[in-house]
């Protein structure tokens, strides 16, 4: 029977700088029942606090609500684990909320087939930014990647949109059926899960074209 | 304990590449931003570009764009710098350094460096 | 680029001596600084961040103070340890930029 071995956190995400969650990883239990307990102080601070939520994020995490969460203030924590024969500590993890956002998918992701008389034909694809950003602040910037394949290819080909919010694609496999994704990020932060696959048919009289994409 | 192990030193002639490694360990690699820095002999410290492990999104210093390439392989906790090109001038310490936290870019442990040498 | 100018370039000073560094960004960085020391054939070594917050296990003796533009990173006692480089870093703007670094040097 042993201390228990040193815990590490190795993650924190927040989905809009409102509330976040760290999750720690336990060391060895040293053969005994084990207690962990997280404490934080902002940084400027000296006064250590708890974890105020044990519970929300699952095991072995610590969830900061709303009045918890300061953006612009860096966090410094630690993660202390306890047992009958000693203690351990886990290495300070610094956070700043700013950087550990990680939004839900974009949303409304449409898709068409754009065919235009005096153009060659082109895919042409919109989507909005997940409903709990605030863009309008000017605090976040997102960027977007979108993918796309035919149904039954196995590769994804992946295209990096930047800040727009449409997207048009020129060179196309005609009469395949085709998944688009899409999914975000913020610029210091991390990508969102890909949306929900859109389909869409490509006419067998798309004509290829030899330029490959661009956006507007 | 955090460390992080560079590859050793290059000689390297004027046009051609160098591959620099930097293995972590003590730490979950996928956690933090990974950094590269240079220092000419004799100079101050130059930031060449970042790359996160988790997804390796990277940011590179515009000077340095087109000739560097930052990856990483997970499966080794080991972050790369490729500068190609090379001209007397990147003759220099090379540095990997990881970030100080979950934030902002401030470097809190640093590889013991590599020195590349570019010489015809 | 942000260029950070470090002033002096080098200082000599003696154990005891209170030692001031001082950084002057070319635009405003708000407090977004870190100061680094580095020792001949080694390392940098983080001793600030965030213009003002010691990082774990950095003597009391050194300390920033500024924001803006500029910061002054100060020694209140010199000890025979502390002879080395020290750089500024702005991580305010990409790209990230360093001053040029200030020597302190034994009287």
């Known amino acids: 029977q042993l201390p228990p071995g040193k815990p590490e956190i190795f993650k924190c995400r927040s989905p809009n700088k409102e509330t976040f969650t760290c999750w720690w990883r336990p060391g060895t239990d040293g053969g005994l029942p084990t207690n962990y307990s997280l404490t934080y102080h902002r940084e400027g601070e000296t006064l250590m606090h708890e974890c105020p939520d044990y519970i929300t994020g699952g095991p072995n995490s610590c969830h900061f609500g709303k009045q918890y969460t300061s953006m612009w203030r860096t966090y410094v924590m630690m993660v202390n684990a306890t047992n009958q024969m000693g203690s351990s500590f886990s290495d300070e993890l610094y956070v700043d909320v700013t950087y550990i956002v990680q939004p839900d998918p974009p949303l409304e992701l449409t898709v068409e087939v754009k065919q235009p008389e005096d153009r060659k034909p082109y895919l042409w694809m919109k989507w909005s930014p997940p409903t709990l950003i605030d863009l309008k602040t000017g605090w976040f910037t997102l960027l977007y990647e979108i993918r796309l394949k035919p149904e039954k290819a196995a590769e994804w080909e992946t295209h990096f949109a930047g800040q727009q919010t449409e997207f048009k694609i020129l060179s196309l496999h005609p009469g395949q059926k085709y998944l688009v994704q899409v999914r975000c990020k913020p610029d210091h932060g991390y990508w969102s899960a890909w949306s929900p696959a859109t389909f869409i048919q490509i006419p067998s009289d798309f004509i290829m074209n030899d330029h490959h994409h661009h956006h507007h | 304990e955090v460390q992080l192990v560079q590859s050793g030193a290059e000689v390297k002639k004027p046009g051609s590449s160098v591959k620099v490694s930097c293995k972590a360990s003590g730490y979950t690699f996928t956690t933090y931003w990974m950094h590269w820095v240079r220092q000419a002999p004799g100079q101050g410290l130059e930031w060449i570009g970042e790359?996160?492990?988790?997804?390796?999104?990277?940011n590179y210093n515009q000077k340095f764009k087109d000739r560097a390439t930052l990856t990483v392989d997970k499966s080794t906790s080991t972050a790369y710098m490729e500068l190609s090109s090379l001209r007397s001038e990147d003759t220099a310490v090379y540095y990997c350094a990881r970030n100080g936290g979950l934030g902002p870019a401030w470097f809190s442990y640093w590889g013991q460096g590599t020195l590349v040498t570019v010489s015809s | 680029d942000i260029q950070m100018t470090q002033s002096p370039s080098s200082v000599s000073a003696s154990v005891g001596d209170r030692v001031t560094i001082t950084c002057k960004a070319s635009?405003?960085?708000?407090?977004?600084v870190a100061w680094y020391q580095q020792k001949p054939g080694k390392s940098p070594k983080l001793l600030i961040y965030?213009?003002?917050n010691r990082y774990t296990g950095v003597p009391s003796r050194f300390s920033d103070s500024g924001s803006g533009t500029d910061f002054t990173l100060t020694i209140s006692s010199l000890q025979p340890e502390d002879f080395a480089t020290y750089f500024c870093q702005q991580y305010s703007s990409y790209p990230w930029t360093f001053g040029g670094g200030t020597k302190v040097e034994i009287k």
């Open positions: 635009q405003y960085v708000g407090t977004a």
């Open positions: 965030s213009a003002s």
């Open positions: 790359i996160d492990p988790s997804d390796s999104y990277s």
